[in-house]
């Protein structure tokens, strides 16, 4: 779901699932804005103290990173500019699972929204003809 | 620019509470965690823990737990801590703070003094 | 947990000259994934909150004088003030902030010889 009003942009994300040892995608996108430079893209975690991700000023910021997530974490730097915030999550562990945030700033205003993210061991049905 | 109020000057009898609270503006409130540390008179640095204010998820200290509750007010842009069950080793200087990690700004400090 | 041991206690520096202060963790501070050390310094002068002046271990926060650099990495840390002025006396502490809980080395105060 994501949030619009005054002062607001509008952020969507789709809740997804991660396979234990792969790497996931947490998909976030948001209304673009014309300079990388205003853009701020911060993604929280319930039960986390620090930040899962944060990119701001056109590259990642790391002194308030969780150290849960130290190392796995990476978002999609050329496609900001166009509204992608989405979250590549390395090396996913069960823990990982739970309620996130995408939280965007720009020159035009705030929003954030919320993902499910659901941790397993899911492999792909076999299909036989 | 980014600022940390802060309430002012407790005098506490022991076994008591206090409630410290400090007040965020210049920047999202939601975006980072709010720290505690304290400073006893003439000593050092002490973190006591943290609260991340847009899911209410807390940490604290070992030497804390059981008698500190950290809390945050989304709608207000405050923090609180409470510490419960005063004593005399608990008159110190608490401080909250932006961030988690690297804490580059803090607030004023609140004196709370434990004396019968 | 990791304990932060500084030494000197205290240090008393004409000024002009250099002042020193070392810094240990107890187990490492550098962090494999990207290679920096979560190792932070402060100031603290009487009455004040503590003022940040060095993060990643040695690099400067804005609008803090170059006399104030910091080098090490892994355990062991430095912080160098190449010529003392009057307005650096004060209580100087290093950080970790590679884990929690954070924690603070004892202080180091410095003074005028």
């Known amino acids: 779901f994501g949030i619009s009003g005054r002062h607001s942009i509008t952020v969507t994300t789709v809740a997804s699932a991660g396979n234990i040892g792969e790497d996931g995608i947490l998909s976030c996108t948001f209304e673009p804005d014309i300079k990388l430079s205003d853009i701020v893209i911060q993604w929280l975690k319930e039960g986390v103290l620090g930040l899962v991700h944060e990119f701001k000023e056109g590259k990642d910021e790391l002194s308030e990173q969780d150290e849960m997530f130290r190392g796995r974490t990476a978002v999609f730097a050329d496609q900001v500019i166009v509204g992608n915030a989405s979250l590549r999550l390395k090396n996913v562990q069960l823990t990982d699972a739970g309620t996130y945030k995408c939280y965007i700033i720009t020159s035009k205003g705030k929003g954030n929204a919320n993902l499910e993210y659901k941790t397993g061991a899911f492999s792909m049905p076999e299909v036989n003809v | 620019q980014v600022q940390l109020v802060q309430s002012g000057a407790e005098v506490k009898k022991p076994g008591s509470s206090v409630k410290v609270s400090c007040k965020a503006s210049?920047?999202?409130?939601?975006?980072?965690?709010i720290t505690w540390v304290r400073q006893a008179p003439g000593q050092g640095l002490e973190w006591i823990g943290g609260?991340?204010?847009?899911?209410?998820?807390?940490k604290y200290a070992q030497k804390f737990q059981g008698r500190v509750t950290i809390t945050a007010d989304e709608s207000t842009s405050t923090a609180y801590m409470e510490l419960s069950s005063l004593r005399s080793e608990d008159t110190a200087v608490y401080y909250c703070?932006?961030?988690?990690?690297?804490?580059?700004?803090w607030g004023q400090g609140t004196l709370v003094t434990v004396s019968s | 947990d990791i304990v932060m041991t500084q030494s000197p206690d205290s240090l008393a520096v004409s000024l002009g000259e250099r002042a020193t202060i070392n810094c240990k963790s107890s187990q490492s501070v550098l962090s494999s994934s990207n290679n920096k050390n979560y190792l932070a310094w402060y100031q603290q002068k009487p009455g004040q909150p503590p003022k940040l002046l060095i993060y990643w271990a040695s690099t400067r926060e804005s609008g803090v004088p170059d006399r104030f650099s910091g080098s090490g990495s892994g355990t062991d840390f430095t912080l160098t003030i190449s010529s003392l002025q009057a307005e650096d006396v004060a209580v100087y502490y290093c950080?970790?902030?590679?884990?929690?809980?954070?924690?603070f080395g004892q202080g180091t105060k410095v003074e005028i010889k």
């Open positions: 609260i991340n204010p847009i899911f209410g998820t807390a």
């Open positions: 950080q970790q902030y590679y884990s929690t809980p954070l924690a």
């Open positions: 703070a932006k961030g988690q990690a690297l804490i580059q700004h």
């Open positions: 210049g920047y999202s409130f939601i975006s980072y965690a």
